[in-house]
Each structure stands twice: as C-alpha cells, then as structure tokens.
C-alpha cells in the first residue's frame, strides 16, 4: 500500500503519458487521478511501466471500482490485466467477446493461469452457455479448453456449437467428456451424408454406443485405428468379427499391432477363435 | 452380491510349486464382461501383478513370471486356480485372487492369503 | 513393461487438507489408468476408474484426472478415514503394472 502524500507543485497528470514513466511510486498515487486513469486506461499498455507502477495504477483503480470494474475499463486493461487476482476477477461482470479476447490475448502462449480460467468461468456464466462463437475463441487460444471442463459443464454447450469444435481440441478429452459431447455431435452433424459425416464425427466417436458402431460398420468408413483404439471398451465388446472387419476396412491388419492393448485386447479376448481366424492374422483369443 | 475367498497352503518349501484356489461366490466365474486376476503383495512392499484367466481358458501373465506361472479356470466348481513353480523365498507374498471388470478396474478383491516360502 | 512411477512416495497431511498424488506412465496408457487405496491388512479397494471415474460407494472427495501419460488423484479434503496407501495401475498394456504407491500420514 501507497501512502497519501500530496502530488508536488506541477507534477499534477493531465494526461496518462510517457511523461509518467519517472515518477516514483508515491508520486504516481498522488498525481494521477483515478477517474483519468479510468478514461484512458487503452494508453497505459503503451507506456513502459514498472511491475511497481502498474501496482500502483491497480490500487487506483481497485479504490475507484471497489466493487469490481466497469467492461469500459476490463477491455482495456492490457497488461494490468496480469496483476489481477482471480478474486478481482469474480467481482467483475463481462459480456463482450471482444473484451473477453483482449484480455485472452495478453496471456497468449501462455498456460491457462487462475485468472483466466477465472475470467473464461464468469463469461460463460454470463451468457448461461458455451455459443460457438466463444468456443471458437476459446479453443483458437487454448485448445486444450473443452477438455478441461467437466461432463457438467459441457451439458450446457449447444449442438450447434460443436461445428467450432475440431479434432485436436478433443485430443485430451477423458471417455466421461466424450459421452456428453458425441450425442450433441451425432445432432449437429445428422444432416451430412455418409462420408462427409464420418469425417466430422470422428473425433466423437469415444462416446459412441455399440448400436451407432454396427451403423457405422455398413457404410464402408474405414476407420482408422487409432480412432478404434479410442472407442469404448463397452461399445467395442458386443461387435463381431465380421463388423469390426467392416468398420476397419482396409485397417483391420493394423489389429495384430494393438493385440496387447485395449481395447482391442478385451475384443480379442470374446470373440470365438475360428472367427478371429478368418481375418487371417494370427490373433489368438 | 460377488465374493472371491482364497483357499491354499500357507507355508511352501524352496523350489517346490505353490498352488491356491479362488472360489467365487455371489456370482459366475464365466461373466461376460469379467477376468480373474491373481496380484501378490511381499511383505511390506508394492503390488504385482500375475496373471489373468478368462472363462474360455485364455491366460496372460506377467513376463517376468511367465515361465513359472500356471493360472487355470473350472467354470463348474465356479473356481480359478493360480500355480507357480520353482518358488523361492522372493514368493512370499499375501496372495490376492481379485476381479476385473473390462469397464472398470479390480472391483472386488479376496482378503488375501500369506504365503511364506521356507525350508 | 510400461512403468508407472508415483510421487511422492510418502506425505504428510491434516484432516480438511487437499491432497494431490500424481502417478506418470512411462508411455502413453490413454485414459486406462485406475486408482486402489489400501489400509494396513486389508485387500486394495478401487477409488477411480477410467483415470476421472468414480467407482460406485466412493465419496465424492476423491477425483482423478489426466490422460495419455500423466494422471492426478485428488482427495478435495483429507478425512480420517484416508489415511492409507494409494496404488496407481495401468491396464492399457496386456502386462498390467502399478506405481510404487503413495502412503499418505497423519501430520
């Protein structure tokens, strides 16, 4: 904390400038009017400030704004913006994509930190659900974002936003994830034709159920194996042979390399020897 | 509601084969979904695990005891048995025969027996 | 064999504290990772399945996360009953291997 000291003769800021780079910390909370500061809060970032004086620039704020600042002044905040504190954030109120992407870019190449996991928790809150125009923000600075929230929490993003969804967003995503987002996929995407589908719901397919697998099975999508290799156990147990041979497609050979590895293990291990024998392979059951 | 109980000898002599016995009760031994599993735990130390029986009599076993290891089912007595020969006073353990459901992990366990490998 | 090595090997904790033992795969295990407790004399009990699935009974201040190589078990506040052994296992690879297992104590 500052002390209040008066500002000396003539030093008195009219304007938020470079002229304020030389003035010590207490000579700043005496000659910068916070209401100023508030106004022209898009020069500061400008300006090469101290971690000091940006502390101090904070404190003048925080006592204009005690109970959490105006979006006028969040858009603009910049860099001071990492002098924030998740619980400074929880007071604040923002609806704006583009405030939300300022603030998201002074953090960029960085990892989520409190505060903008913070931030991104009251914005969502905020609109009440994940639209796919915040998605496509979020997940085009952290693509790990949609991974990072819990099965809850996804029950509130819309089918129609899965279209801003793509496949490496879901990359660290865990099976209880993908059982919530595959239902609103297999909705958004249910007007698309066959092999156009299967390109855009690949990346769900985690949280199929058997009964889409066997459909998948007879429209010759031949699907990768790393893709099966992601697939449920409890959807992958009940195929047979024949519809695994199917679904694969050319792929199936690629089942002797994952013979030690689930799922394909515990498939292997129900099926009846004579039929794993027929994929010629050597898979023993 | 499944149980699995452990039955067998608690004190084996140096290169002779320990045999235990797994009876499971509450429940089938040839479910769908499930593998028997044998782990063993040494005094004081972390778990290992053996080896795996299905009901159709596929096995896999742990490399490092694969040449000494001897896991077999009687889906009519509803019963899984574990063998392992040559044992040596690195064999004792508490022996614990134990469930594993494909969806989920080792969801029931027995209560274990002490095995001691002595002269 | 794929290893799994948990840290720490032993902690400390109080009632009402968050306790976090991480377990690292030494190659990708994707989500096939499970968590055991055990207490003195007695057989394993699972905690978390599927690395984030709570197993039936347990209550709901133990979570896991993580998948692919690193994996998190949490108790959000330690209570008495907690104090044990904890046990990671993978079951991606057909030769099944625990970590070293975490003993968590009484401070």
């Known amino acids: 904390e500052v002390e209040k000291t008066a500002c000396p003769s003539g030093k008195k800021a009219r304007e938020i400038d470079e002229s304020l780079i030389f003035y010590k910390k207490w000579e700043l909370e005496a000659c910068v009017d916070a209401a100023l500061l508030a106004t022209q809060m898009d020069r500061v970032n400008a300006i090469p400030f101290t971690y000091e004086q940006l502390d101090v620039l904070k404190h003048k704020l925080d006592e204009l704004y005690p109970q959490g600042y105006p979006e006028s002044v969040i858009q603009h905040l910049g860099y001071l913006f990492l002098k924030m504190s998740p619980e400074d954030i929880r007071k604040w109120n923002v609806t704006s994509l583009e405030t939300l992407k300022a603030l998201l870019e002074v953090n960029k190449g960085h990892e989520m930190s409190p505060q903008v996991a913070t931030l991104i928790d009251r914005f969502v809150k905020g609109r009440g659900q994940l639209d796919k125009d915040t998605l496509d923000t979020l997940t085009a600075f952290y693509p790990g974002y949609l991974c990072s929230l819990s099965p809850e929490e996804l029950s509130s993003v819309p089918p129609s936003s899965i279209w801003a969804v793509r496949p490496q967003d879901l990359d660290t995503c865990d099976p209880r994830q993908l059982d919530v987002l595959y239902p609103k996929a297999r909705l958004a995407f249910q007007n698309m034709n066959g092999s156009e589908y299967f390109v855009k719901i690949q990346s769900f397919l985690g949280g199929a159920p058997t009964e889409d697998l066997k459909a998948l099975s007879q429209q010759n999508v031949s699907m990768d194996l790393a893709t099966f290799m992601k697939l449920r156990t409890d959807a992958v147990l009940p195929l047979t042979v024949a519809e695994v041979q199917k679904l694969l497609g050319p792929h199936v050979e690629g089942l002797k390399a994952e013979e030690r590895h689930r799922p394909v293990r515990d498939w292997i291990l129900r099926q009846r020897q004579d039929d794993l024998d027929t994929l010629g392979l050597g898979l023993q059951g | 509601q499944v149980q699995l109980q452990e039955s067998g000898p608690g004190l084996v002599k140096p290169s002779e084969t320990l045999s235990l016995t797994c009876t499971v009760s509450?429940?089938?031994?040839?479910?769908?979904?499930?593998?028997w599993s044998w782990i063993r735990q040494p005094p004081g130390k972390g778990l290992e695990w053996i080896g795996y029986?299905?009901?159709?009599?596929?096995?896999n076993y742990n490399p490092s005891l694969k040449s000494r290891v001897t896991i077999s089912v009687d889906t009519s007595k509803n019963q899984f048995s574990l063998k392992l020969s040559s044992v040596t006073a690195a064999d004792t353990a508490v022996y614990y025969c134990?469930?594993?459901?494909?969806?989920?992990?080792?969801?029931?366990w027995g209560q274990g027996t002490m095995v001691t490998v002595s002269s | 064999d794929i290893q799994m090595t948990q840290s720490p090997s032993s902690l400390s904790a109080s009632v009402g504290d968050r306790v976090t033992i991480t377990c690292r795969a030494s190659?990708?295990?994707?989500?096939?990772l499970n968590w055991y407790q055990q207490k003195p004399g007695k057989a394993p009990k699972l905690l978390i399945y599927?690395?984030?699935s709570l197993q039936s009974g347990v209550p709901s201040r133990f979570s896991g996360s993580g998948s692919g190589t690193d994996f998190t078990l949490t108790i959000s506040s330690l209570q008495p009953e907690d104090f044990a052994t904890y046990y990671c296992?993978?079951?991606?690879?057909?030769?099944?291997?625990f970590g070293g297992g975490t003993k968590v104590e009484i401070k």
């Open positions: 134990a469930r594993e459901d494909a969806l989920t992990g080792f969801d029931i």
């Open positions: 509450g429940g089938s031994v040839s479910s769908f979904t499930d593998t």
């Open positions: 029986i299905y009901y159709s009599g596929s096995t």
């Open positions: 190659q990708s295990i994707s989500s096939y």
């Open positions: 599927a690395a984030s």
């Open positions: 296992q993978q079951s991606y690879d057909a030769s099944y291997t």
